[in-house]
């Protein structure tokens, strides 16, 4: 029950996170005009990953897309790429996790398959969240660098006569949406990975007891070969009772009535 809840919650959290990453990627307010300590202008500038906008005091807003690909800064291209990779991985992760949900029955899918799918989607969510966080952080760093550069050149005098005010940009709403969404996707992915452990079919590591018959005398030798842990062809009906939590040194094998011929 706890596993189902963890998996379900992980899915929902990731879903919200990915929706947030998509929203952040589409938002125009990645950077907004800094109004603090700036001459007050009757226009407000803000920029996104795909277009820049200007809002006049009347409320009239005009947006222009970045119609060039080669003319854009490499950092902006990198941020776009990170966000898109995050969205794609997240979307695939969501698709995989739907089929992996314990509460959904699809044919005769074994728990081991569901566990693998849950782990896969969990890893995808983690990478997706990291991509979004990285993308937003790269953009934020770019803004901080440009902010201090434009502060240093706030007023660039033209022949000492005319002053040109440089527009400074600060963090826009999309950055915060992106950070939160990336974090949620990451948390959702971790929850899916935790749920995967509980979904895995339980198997026991039987402790093999070997014995050597030299001539007519029977010698018992404890702690021989360890049983296969589940990837071989001889593991079909094995059960794991100790979950592999203890080492061979910690668990001593004692002879039972089945150990002797």
């Amino acid at each position: 029950m706890a596993v189902t809840a963890c998996q379900g919650l992980g899915f929902v959290v990731s879903l919200i996170g990915i929706a947030g990453i998509i929203a952040a990627t589409c938002m125009d307010q990645w950077s907004t005009q800094d109004l603090y300590n700036n001459p007050v202008t009757a226009v407000f500038n803000y920029q996104g990953l795909w277009r820049s906008c200007v809002r006049e005091s009347s409320g009239f807003t005009e947006c222009r897309g970045y119609f060039t690909l080669l003319g854009l800064p490499a950092m902006l291209q990198a941020v776009r790429a990170l966000m898109i990779v995050g969205i794609v991985l997240g979307a695939i992760g969501l698709l995989v996790s739907i089929f992996a949900l314990k509460c959904i029955r699809i044919g005769s899918m074994e728990d081991s398959a569901k566990a693998n799918m849950t782990l896969t989607s969990g890893i995808m969510f983690i990478v997706s969240g990291l991509c979004a966080i990285a993308g937003v952080s790269v953009f934020a760093n770019m803004l901080v660098t440009n902010f201090w550069m434009s502060t240093a050149n706030m007023y660039t005098g033209m022949g000492g006569m005319v002053q040109t005010v440089q527009t400074r940009y600060t963090f826009g709403a999309a950055l915060f949406v992106g950070w939160v969404a990336g974090g949620l996707t990451l948390i959702g992915g971790v929850m899916m990975c935790i749920a995967c452990r509980g979904l895995a079919p339980e198997e026991t590591n039987y402790k093999a007891v070997s014995y050597h018959a030299s001539g007519h005398s029977v010698a018992y030798k404890p702690g021989g070969f360890k049983a296969s842990t589940g990837f071989g062809s001889n593991t079909k009906n094995k059960k794991i009772y100790d979950g592999g939590a203890r080492t061979e040194d910690e668990v001593q094998s004692y002879p039972s009535k089945h150990d002797y011929v």
């Epitope: 820049s52 200007v54 009347s58």
Partner: antibody
Framework: QVQLQQSGAELARPGASVKMSCKAS????????IHWLKQGPGQGLEWIGY????????NYNQKFKYKTTLTADKSSSTAYIQLSSLTSDDSAVYYC?????????????WGQGTSVTVSS | DIVMTQSPSSQTVTAGEKVTLSCRSS????????????LTWYQQKPGQPPKLLIY???TRESGVPDRFTGSGSGTYFTFTISSVQAEDLAVYYC?????????FGAGTKLELK
């Protein structure tokens, strides 16, 4: 058609206050900001400030901040300007003007003006 | 505050003549976000309120004759009347529509020769 009808001329004593009105018609009043401007006799134009009737947000020219109060009444589609502590320097024609939408913050329609004379 | 300087303060013209008025601002009125100049031109005839002619430095308001044109960028702007008509005799103001408080030039008065 868009019209801004301003109240009649005012004659006031120094130290008194006057309140002028600007009634808008022909458009949705709260959608557009109303600017107020002053033009002294034989002088140029001075921007006093503006009010957004929808949000009641005001933006004043610091020079007129303590002299004027801008208000608006959505129900009657009317904007008001109040001048306090009048002096002879306040004698001028006061205009209200509508800020155009998508007009680069320009004022596209103007009232006919209200003449204020401060005299003892 | 932004200082708007207009020249000449007055100009005597004859009908049909081409007239160019200039306006200079103390700071650039060019907005980098949309590459538009927030400069406006108004015409004011005696006893009348100002009338909007040009906004965004070069965009003509609807209903304004095409003999009126605006140009310039940054801090220097010009206003041209290609062929002056008798009804064009008025005072022309340029206005900073970018920085608060909005400021106007002292105006250029067009007079008939």
């Amino acid at each position: 058609q868009v019209q801004l009808q301003q109240s009649g001329a005012e004659l006031a004593r120094p130290g008194a206050s006057v309140k002028m009105s600007c009634k808008a018609s022909g458009y949705t009043f709260p959608t557009y900001s109303i600017h107020w401007l002053k033009q002294g006799p034989g002088q140029g134009l001075e921007w006093i400030g503006y009010i957004n009737p929808n949000t009641i947000y005001t933006n004043y020219n610091q020079k007129f901040k303590y002299k004027t109060t801008l208000t608006a009444d959505k129900s009657s589609s009317t904007a008001y300007i109040q001048l306090s502590s009048l002096t002879s320097d306040d004698s001028a024609v006061y205009y209200c003007a509508r800020e155009g939408y998508g007009r680069g913050n320009a004022m596209d329609y103007w009232g006919q003006g209200t003449s204020v004379t401060v005299s003892s | 505050d932004i200082v708007m300087t207009q020249s000449p303060s007055s100009q005597t013209v004859t009908a049909g003549e081409k007239v160019t008025l200039s306006c200079r601002s103390s700071q650039s009125l060019l907005n980098g976000g949309n590459q538009k100049n927030y400069l406006t031109w108004y015409q004011q005839k005696p006893g009348q309120p100002p009338k909007l002619l040009i906004y965004w430095a070069s965009t003509r308001e609807s209903g304004v004759p095409d003999r009126f044109t605006g140009s310039g960028s940054g801090t220097y702007f010009t206003f041209t009347i290609s062929s002056v008509q008798a009804e064009d005799l008025a005072v022309y103001y340029c206005q900073n529509a970018y920085f608060y408080p909005f400021t106007f030039g002292a105006g250029t008065k067009l007079e008939l020769k």
